[in-house]
Interface confidence: low
């Protein structure tokens, strides 16, 4: 039998589930842990202080908890402040917590004291400098000023002028006396220790406004944006650059040391980024307002004026169209154009359309068409209804048949089919 059916092995409301290995396992509700949910979860009571994260575990049948403390706190329940949080140790000393809960600093060489802030004076502890060298204390250390003929951190070595070599930048040192030397410098350097970089720029070949930048036994040309190459002799094709050097659809033509733009209509300027002000040459009439557009302009007309330049009187002002018509003005000649509503016709839309006499009868099922102002009416024959007599009247809707008879709708009338034992028009 499945292990979970044999009476649940889970205590305290634990839910029994069967593992792939056919063993039973318990899914414990909050507050309970253990293989059979038999142990109280020690984390349930929130034993960790502050933002400490509680983790429970079961060891040898006993439920235990541990707290993962946030920065600045320590202890089994995160209730103790961390004395190292304030970085009390100076000069890179390592901070740890002592058995008394206070901080301990492991001082680096050259420093001492509880917080490693005190400098050790190495010059007072014996005489570290050899051969009569003068000891100079420095923060965290010391240095020796050696007498002539000695060298090394402690003046321990007899001075050999070329060991180590004082020659910089790859220069070769040659001993020229007991304490003297010469440096043979590599091309591009000069000076006592080859420390001076020779200026290679005099007589440079940087062209087209290129700036010479001195290198080591060489120079480089820093070119203006229009030129490139070793000596700025190579023209930069601005037309290949992204984004395009010519804006607003302008065509780019590369030139030596620059480029030129051919602008499309309506644009001007070196890179075709200026919109030509077409209002500068526009002639809007009668106090109209000119609005510049790309390669065109627009005149905003005052009341009563129309046309591209507002030079025409607006014929619509006098309401020449029938009341429901829409009036527009012809921008060329200023005349009114009336757009008629359904049922009206004519230049001013004031003539009624006789819908009954144009084309086929609009009324269905032989209905009679009657013209009206702007529309028409249909007078329907018996048995039909609707605006165009398109709907058959269902005479059965009023339930005229009696004694459970069946009603049959007919055009303009109805028929009752009577039950056995009844007769009459209505089976009455």
């Amino acid at each position: 039998a499945p292990p979970c059916l044999d009476g649940s092995p889970c205590a305290n409301g634990g839910r029994c589930t069967q593992l792939p290995s056919r063993e039973a396992a318990c899914l414990c509700p909050p507050g309970w842990v253990g293989e059979r949910c038999q142990l109280e979860d020690p984390c349930h009571s929130g034993p960790c202080a502050g933002r400490g994260v509680c983790q429970s575990s079961v060891v040898a049948g006993t439920a235990r908890f541990s707290c993962r403390c946030p920065r600045g706190f320590r202890g089994p329940d995160c209730s103790l402040p961390d004395p190292c949080l304030s970085s009390p140790c100076a000069h890179g000393a390592r901070c740890s917590v002592g058995p008394d809960g206070r901080f301990l600093c492991s001082c680096p060489p050259g420093y001492q004291g509880r917080s490693c802030r005190s400098d050790v004076d190495e010059c007072r502890v014996g005489e570290p400098c050899r051969h009569g060298g003068t000891c100079l204390n420095t923060p965290g250390s010391f240095r020796c000023q050696c007498p002539a003929g000695y060298t090394g951190p402690l003046c321990e070595n007899p001075a050999v002028p070329c060991a180590p070599s004082p020659c910089r930048n790859g220069g070769t040192c040659r001993q020229s006396g007991d304490l003297t030397y010469d440096c043979a410098c590599l091309p591009g350097f000069e000076g006592q220790n080859c420390e001076v970089n020779v200026d290679d720029c005099p007589g440079h070949r940087c062209l087209n406004g290129g700036t010479c930048v001195d290198g080591v036994n060489t120079y480089n040309c820093q070119c203006p944006p229009e030129w490139t190459g070793q000596f700025c002799t190579e023209d930069v094709d601005e037309c290949q650059l992204q984004p395009n050097a010519c804006h607003n659809g302008g065509t780019c033509f590369n030139t030596l040391g620059g480029h030129s733009c051919v602008c499309v209509n309506g644009w001007t300027g070196e890179s075709c980024s200026q919109n030509i002000d077409d209002c500068a040459t526009a002639v809007c009439f009668h106090g109209a307002t000119c609005h510049d557009r790309v390669a065109s302009f627009y005149c905003a007309c005052p009341m009563g004026k129309t046309g591209l330049l507002c030079h025409l009187d607006d014929a619509c002002v006098s309401n020449p169209c029938h009341e429901d018509a829409i009036c527009d003005t012809n921008p060329v000649n200023g005349r009114a154009i009336c757009t008629c509503p359904p049922g009206f016709t004519g230049g001013a839309c004031d003539q009624d359309v006789d819908e009954c006499s144009i084309g086929a009868n609009p009324c269905e099922h032989l209905g009679r068409c009657v013209n009206t102002q702007g529309s028409f009416l249909c007078q329907c024959g018996r048995g039909y209804t609707g605006p165009r007599c398109e709907t058959d009247v269902n005479e059965c809707l009023s339930g005229p048949c009696r004694n459970q008879a069946t009603c049959l709708d007919r055009i303009g009338q109805f028929t009752c089919i009577c039950m056995a034992g009844f007769t009459g028009t209505y089976c009455e």
């Epitope: 790859g170 590599l186 290198g215 060489t218 190459g229 070793q230 190579e234």
Partner: antibody, heavy 122, light 110 residues
């Protein structure tokens, strides 16, 4: 845009010869010093040699490992760099790249070609 | 003969900062500029840093270079998966009129 395309690589027996080409486009070829750099399979980059443009003297320098066996040349009228490899050894097996030298100071190689593989094997 | 020394490999997690060192001598790095190249798997090297610390256009400012004495280093901040590649330092040796490359460093993004 600036482009370098190498060709001529292939399989050759030890002691044999091969000529690599590098076709350049998109810049004034004669103004630039050109370099060959190689990379043995799974290994690092090794400089092979360089040739200055004719207008700057056309001087040529080689790495010690190829001196006397390899010859670098250029044809500025064809915008093409060449590497003639003679007396090939198995250790010459590598991808060979050509690269434009933007400045000798600091070895500024930009751009590089896609490379061509030379295999020296018996 | 490799005359510029680089660590064979470095690694870092996404978002981290890594540095690659390049050690030379007074006859190469000591008196010249250093360049750095990035070589993504199966592709040709690409210029990453020139004149010790200059970035070509198109190279993100996460990449930076520096030089001190006879050593140079490349730093990459905010590490991304696409930074996984081989990195080479390079300079010019004036004494032998030749270019030299470091042995290369393989960067792995964990």
């Amino acid at each position: 845009q600036v482009q370098l395309v190498e060709s001529g690589g292939g399989l050759v027996k030890p002691g044999g010869s091969l000529r690599l080409s590098c076709a350049a486009s998109g810049f004034t070829f004669s103004s630039y010093t050109m370099n060959w750099v190689r990379q043995a399979p799974g290994k690092g980059l090794e400089w092979v040699g360089r040739v200055k443009g004719e207008q700057f003297g056309g001087s040529i320098h080689y790495a010690a490992s190829v001196k006397g066996r390899f010859t670098i040349s250029r044809d500025d009228s064809k915008n093409t760099l060449y590497l003639q490899m003679n007396s090939l050894k198995t250790e010459d097996t590598a991808v060979y790249y050509c690269a434009r030298e933007r400045s000798r100071a600091g070895s500024i190689f930009d751009p590089w070609g896609q490379g061509t593989l030379v295999t020296v094997s018996s | 003969d490799i005359v510029l020394t680089q660590p064979p490999s470095v690694s870092g997690a996404p978002g981290q900062r890594v540095t690659i060192s390049c050690s030379g001598s007074s006859s190469n790095i000591g008196f010249n500029y250093v360049s750095w190249y990035q070589q993504l798997p199966g592709t040709a090297p690409k210029l990453l840093i020139y004149y010790n610390n200059q970035r070509p256009s198109g190279v993100p400012d996460r990449f930076s270079g520096s030089k001190s004495g006879t050593s140079a280093s490349l730093a990459i901040t905010g590490l991304q998966a696409e930074d996984e590649a081989d990195y080479y330092c390079s300079t010019w040796t004036g004494t032998s009129e030749s270019h030299v490359f470091g042995g290369g460093t393989k960067l792995t993004v964990l």
